[in-house]
Interface confidence: low
């Protein structure tokens, strides 16, 4: 005896209640081999992990791990996370143009330096990819008497904690 | 030789999780779907959930909020957790495998498990 | 889920008896239905598959037969190696779900 399920194809289930008919996967639910009676849930891309193919009739989502992000607009593949002096953008990483720094690994944007002048201060250690500068005391805190500056830490985006 | 055998701890205190482990050998855990199976001892058969070659599950309604099937492919291992035992879960535990054609055409020799504490 | 039903709950019969084991589904389940075989060892194998099918290496004196809701396993002719219990599993749908078995004995 052939089993009638046998022909329902990938995309399908063999639908018990009504006498066999292939019928179409539910949404959010696939079958990738034919004859099956019942169609698989797709996998949702939680916690840590994104979505890097949606789920389609015939296949189940791809995840991408914790350390990778989705590349394009259907996730079509996993990219390694950006690292400090890179920023994410709609092509991947991409480099801090000069002038701009990203201290954070994984997250954030590409930030301009600090602009030490506008605060009067002298620039003490130049700006990196992945550093701002470091401003140096303003000409009035050299004066006779006055005590040690300890540089300003570099700025950072609100709600992000320190690496 | 397709062969599949459970490996479990025996006996497991009441309220704990349980933990067996099904090895695979002669057959791809890719291409075969993989049952466990149950039997209370003097009773019948029980199906407990089964895990397709794609990785999900589906699993007893009345047991689902305690159980747990994974798989690692590369181990060809298939494990089941059930968790808050009573000594209801008292059986035998077997894993079997699940063909295209949807019966189990090989078992494990199956692994007892005692709850008492 | 659905429910199965095996009648007798054990049998005892003579060797060279035909013996009959009955499965009933508590609703239509088309001819997705399996009987196994689990001998006193624990050891359980596949005998019919698809109603009627017989597996591979299973002696041709077991047959099955039925549809929708009543199924039967069939020895033609008991031999001392079928003491064993008998069980009939569908697989119309999730979850899957066995009968109570049949506890076969030779008198």
């Known amino acids: 005896l052939q089993d009638p399920c046998s022909n329902c194809p990938a995309g399908t289930f063999c639908d018990n209640n009504r006498n066999q008919i292939c019928s179409p996967c539910p949404p959010n639910s696939f079958s990738s081999a034919g004859g099956q009676r019942t169609c698989d849930i797709c996998r949702q891309c939680k916690g840590v992990f994104r979505t890097r193919k949606e789920c389609s009739s015939t296949s189940n989502a791809e995840c991408c791990i914790e350390g990778f992000h989705c590349l394009g607009p259907q996730c079509t593949r996993c990219e390694k996370d950006c690292r400090p002096g890179q920023e994410l953008t709609k092509q991947g990483c991409k480099t801090c143009s000069l002038g701009t720094f990203n201290d954070q690994n994984g997250t954030g944007v590409c930030r301009p330096w600090t602009n030490c002048s506008l605060d009067g201060k002298s620039v003490l250690v130049n700006g990196t990819k992945e550093r701002d500068v470091v401003c140096g005391p303003s000409p009035a805190d050299l004066s006779p008497g006055a005590s040690s500056v300890t540089p300003p830490a570099p700025a950072r985006e609100p709600g992000h904690s320190p690496q | 030789q397709v062969q599949l055998q459970e490996s479990g701890p025996g006996l497991v205190k009441p309220s704990e999780t349980l933990s067996i482990t099904c090895t695979v050998s002669g057959s791809s855990l890719t291409s075969y779907g993989v049952h466990w199976v149950r039997q209370p001892p003097g009773k019948g058969l029980e199906g407990l959930g089964v895990i397709w070659p794609g990785g999900s599950t589906n699993y007893n309604s009345a047991l689902m909020s305690r159980l747990t099937i994974s798989k690692d492919n590369s181990k060809s291992q298939v494990s089941l957790k059930m968790s808050s035992l009573t000594a209801a879960d008292t059986a035998m535990y077997y894993c079997a495998r699940v063909t295209g054609t949807w019966y189990f055409d090989v078992w494990g020799q199956g692994t007892t498990v005692t709850v008492s504490s | 889920d659905i429910q199965m039903t095996q009648s007798p709950s054990s049998l005892s019969a003579s060797l060279g008896d035909r013996v009959t084991i009955s499965c009933s589904a508590s609703?239509?389940?088309?001819?997705?239905l399996n009987w196994y075989q689990q001998k006193p060892d624990g050891t359980v194998k596949l005998l019919i598959y698809y109603t009627s099918t017989l597996h591979s290496g299973v002696p041709s004196r077991f047959s099955g037969s039925g549809s929708g809701t009543d199924f039967t396993l069939t020895i033609s002719s008991l031999q001392p190696e079928d003491v064993a219990t008998y069980y009939c599993?569908?697989?119309?749908?999730?979850?899957?779900?066995f009968g109570g078995g049949t506890k076969l004995e030779i008198k």
């Open positions: 609703q239509g389940i088309s001819n997705y």
């Open positions: 599993q569908q697989y119309s749908k999730l979850p899957w779900t």
